[in-house]
């Protein structure tokens, strides 16, 4: 789709006469009729297949024509067309005298014609004007012309439709050849895909607008390369999402069990030495002369029978000393070494005695590990998800989050690209390894059958007697340009032989 523009510049008719040589009274009130048609080796009358236009009276006898002249006319004259520009044309410009105000052809006498010029040739689409001057014995016409594409049409023959946009469906402007040019920050075939913040993690991050980096569940930070610990985690970190790896001094599945009670709570009194002894438990080693769990009580040597669990008390200069039986320790033999009786195994692990009860070992159920079965096994280490799927540890199982185009428990199945009916105008979709392919019906082309292509009305060779055939792209019909000696819509009749 485009416009043939004709700019009239100057008309000279010094003697003020008609084509017949008869003078105009009082002068030649001149207007123009323009006919644009398909290329003809010899320009002949007939339909103005590319369009026609008339001007109002522009002047008398000799005059210059101003741009955008007043009186309802436009200069340059516009001859719009809604087909692919063929690159060739024929142009007829007639100058007429208007005795009255009615400029319709039927209202004018045939001898009101002042002059008629006809040209033909090649003309490429472009912004540059072609200047021309046509002279007859009595008149001279100076004009220029060009063909430009209509808004949103591009290419050598104005056949490519491209409308710039900046919305959900695309972010682009149009290049002179009609190809898309993505706005900064956008990419993809239709410039719908934002370019994320530089460095944004390819799997863990995504974006909905340029220079953004949004994290998928379980990830955080500017580039989505830092994990988020488990919801219930208290004093732990992670190396993959939803983990809970305990900080120093903390234990348990959610790192909520204090293994460093001494440092955190300083429970031992009177200068006693504190020793951590498991979850939320501690041992105070009292200085001489003190006793009690927290060494809060003063002691009178062995008189108070301080040694427990069968320990024997020995008096010393600076207090006393307990000799503990096997399996016990502490200042007063008050602590037994940790054994299965202390239920040290988490998450249903079973305890086995070792060294005659002096120590133990935990046998862990599936999905748990660690010396106390306190750690959850990461089921994603075997990379079970196919086709770039993302593995997520979720509850008692693992799950695969599939990339677009894949489905199945392990993302092992390819989703048909044709499921979305991507082919326009009744095109047939074919699933291929490399993507999809559309087979287009007659009159359409392009990757998705989105481009309308003109039907070639000349394909059936409708013109006789070596006539030249042209397709009228506005109506998808043919026009026959007859050689000398033949007439008719198909040039089927010799001149002088009327149709029977």
């Amino acid at each position: 789709s485009g416009v043939f523009q004709l700019q009239l510049q100057e008309f000279v008719n010094e003697r003020g006469v008609l084509a017949s040589g008869r003078p105009c009274e009082p002068g030649c009130r001149t207007f123009f009729r323009v006919c644009l048609k398909h290329f003809q080796a010899v320009v002949s009358p007939g339909p103005c297949t590319f369009g026609s236009v008339s001007t109002p009276v522009l002047g008398t006898n000799s005059f210059a024509v101003r741009d955008d002249s007043s009186g309802g006319g436009r200069n340059p004259l516009q001859l719009p067309f809604n087909f692919t520009w063929p690159g060739t044309f024929s142009l007829i410009i007639e100058a007429w005298h208007a005795p009255g105000d009615d400029l319709r052809p039927e209202a004018l006498p045939p001898d009101a014609l002042i002059s008629k010029i006809a040209i033909q040739g090649s003309l490429a689409v472009g912004q540059n004007w072609l200047l021309d001057e046509q002279t007859s014995t009595l008149t001279r016409l100076r004009y220029s012309y060009r063909v430009i594409c209509s808004d949103n049409y591009y290419g050598d023959n104005c056949s490519r439709l491209c409308k710039k946009r900046n919305d959900h469906f695309g972010h682009y402007v149009c290049q002179p050849d009609g190809n898309l040019s993505c706005l900064p920050g956008w990419t993809g075939e239709y410039c719908q895909q934002p370019i994320c913040l530089s460095g944004c993690h390819e799997q863990n991050g995504y974006c909905s607008k340029p220079a953004e980096c949004l994290c998928r569940p379980g990830w955080q930070g500017r580039l989505c390369n830092e994990c988020i610990p488990h919801n219930g985690c208290r004093h732990g970190t992670c190396s993959t999402p939803w983990q809970c790896t305990c900080d120093e001094g903390w234990g348990g599945l959610f790192c909520d069990q204090d293994l460093n009670y001494c440092t955190h709570h300083s429970p031992c009194k009177n200068g006693a030495t504190c020793s951590n002894s498991g979850q939320r438990s501690y041992t105070c080693t009292c200085r001489p002369g003190y006793t009690g769990v927290d060494c809060e009580l003063e002691l009178s040597e062995c008189d108070s029978n301080p040694c427990r669990n069968g320990g024997s008390c020995k008096d010393q200069e600076d207090g006393y000393h307990c000799l503990c039986p096997p399996g016990y320790y502490g200042l007063h033999c008050e602590h037994s070494t940790l054994s299965c009786a202390d239920s040290p195994c988490f998450n249903g692990g079973s305890c086995r005695e070792r060294n005659q009860g002096a120590s133990y070992a935990c046998e862990c159920p599936p999905n748990f590990t660690g010396s106390n079965c306190e750690k959850k096994v990461d089921r994603c280490t075997s990379n079970p998800c196919a086709n770039g799927g993302q593995c997520l540890n979720r509850g008692p199982s693992r799950m695969c989050r599939c990339r677009p185009g894949f489905t199945g428990t392990y993302c092992e199945r390819h989703v048909s690209d044709c499921a979305r009916n991507p082919c326009a105008h009744g095109g047939t979709c074919h699933d291929l390894e490399s993507g999809l392919m559309c087979t287009c019906p007659a009159g359409f082309s392009g990757r998705r059958c989105e481009v309308r292509t003109s039907i070639d009305a000349c394909a059936s060779s409708p013109c006789f007697n070596r006539a030249t055939c042209y397709t009228d792209l506005s109506t998808d019909t043919f026009v026959c340009n007859c050689p000398y000696g033949f007439v008719g819509s198909r040039c089927e009749f010799p001149v002088g032989l009327p149709p029977s």
Partner: antibody, heavy 118, light 107 residues
Framework: EVQLVESGGGLVQPGGSLRLSCAAS????????MAWVRQAPGKGLEWVAT????????YYRDSVKGRFTISRDNAKNSLYLQMNSLRAEDTAVYYC???????????WGQGTLVTVSS | DIQMTQSPSSLSASVGDRVTITCRAS??????LAWYQQKPGKAPKLLIF???DLADGVPSRFSGSGSGTDFTLTISSLQPEDFATYYC?????????FGQGTKLEIK
């Protein structure tokens, strides 16, 4: 026990400013992303802002962008929300919560009421 | 933004009843959905995350199911302390969004 205690709420005129604080305890504050979530009187819950634990990256809902600033001080186990150019529609109970925009909000404070009115 | 629609908006039930609340997302959110319980004048409390995982200390009468766009919270046998407002929340897409809430009242 995890505890989140908000403070700093009150009555403020439209266009005014307020700074909310949240004191955290019972967990290693520096290890976890934090958020503010609000609830207008008689209405539902609405996420306001988030800050990561790793590098302090911040995110805001569109209606508060440029007016509110979320920040944290790991040494003080504290989360903050600086609210400027307050509007009547910002009136709500503001909750401090542990979580990111892409994770559940596992623990919540008791909330502090912010009333914007002339 | 993803729209989260809860139904019903309010619900009357008796102690011992089995109750189901549904939540629908305007687009696929995989299993990235949480449920919260809120009592008047109190802060919300996380009940369920990742659609079906119970948060620490939540009774087993609460359960969650679904994936994609349709999710449900079920309370198998209502207890007096369960009367409250329940909210669903998606955290699959930015920004996180909540449902409008379902108020569970005593019949």
């Amino acid at each position: 026990e995890v505890q989140l205690v908000e403070s700093g709420g009150g009555l403020v005129q439209p266009g005014g400013s307020l700074r909310l604080s949240c004191a955290a305890s019972g967990f290693t504050f520096s290890n976890f992303p934090m958020a503010w979530v609000r609830q207008a009187p008689g209405k539902g819950l609405e996420w306001v802002a988030t800050i990561s634990s790793s590098d302090g990256t911040t995110y805001y809902r569109d209606s508060v962008k440029g007016r509110f600033t979320i920040s944290r001080d790991n040494a003080k186990n504290s989360l903050y929300l600086q609210m400027n150019s307050l509007r009547a529609e910002d009136t709500a109970v503001y909750y401090c919560a542990r979580g990111y925009y892409n994770s559940p909000f596992a623990y919540w404070g008791q909330g502090t009421l912010v009333t914007v009115s002339s | 933004d993803i729209q989260m629609t809860q139904s019903p908006s309010s619900l009357s039930a008796s102690v011992g009843d089995r109750v189901t609340i549904t939540c629908r997302a305007s687009q696929d959110i995989y299993i990235n959905l949480a449920w919260y319980q809120q009592k008047p004048g109190k802060a919300p409390k996380l009940l369920i995350f990742d659609t079906s995982d119970l948060a620490d200390g939540v009774p087993s009468r609460f359960s969650g199911s679904g994936s994609g766009t349709d999710f449900t919270l079920t309370i198998s046998s209502l207890q007096p302390e369960d009367f409250a407002t329940y909210y669903c929340q998606q955290y699959d897409y930015y920004p996180p969004t909540f449902g409008q809430g379902t108020k569970l009242e005593i019949k």
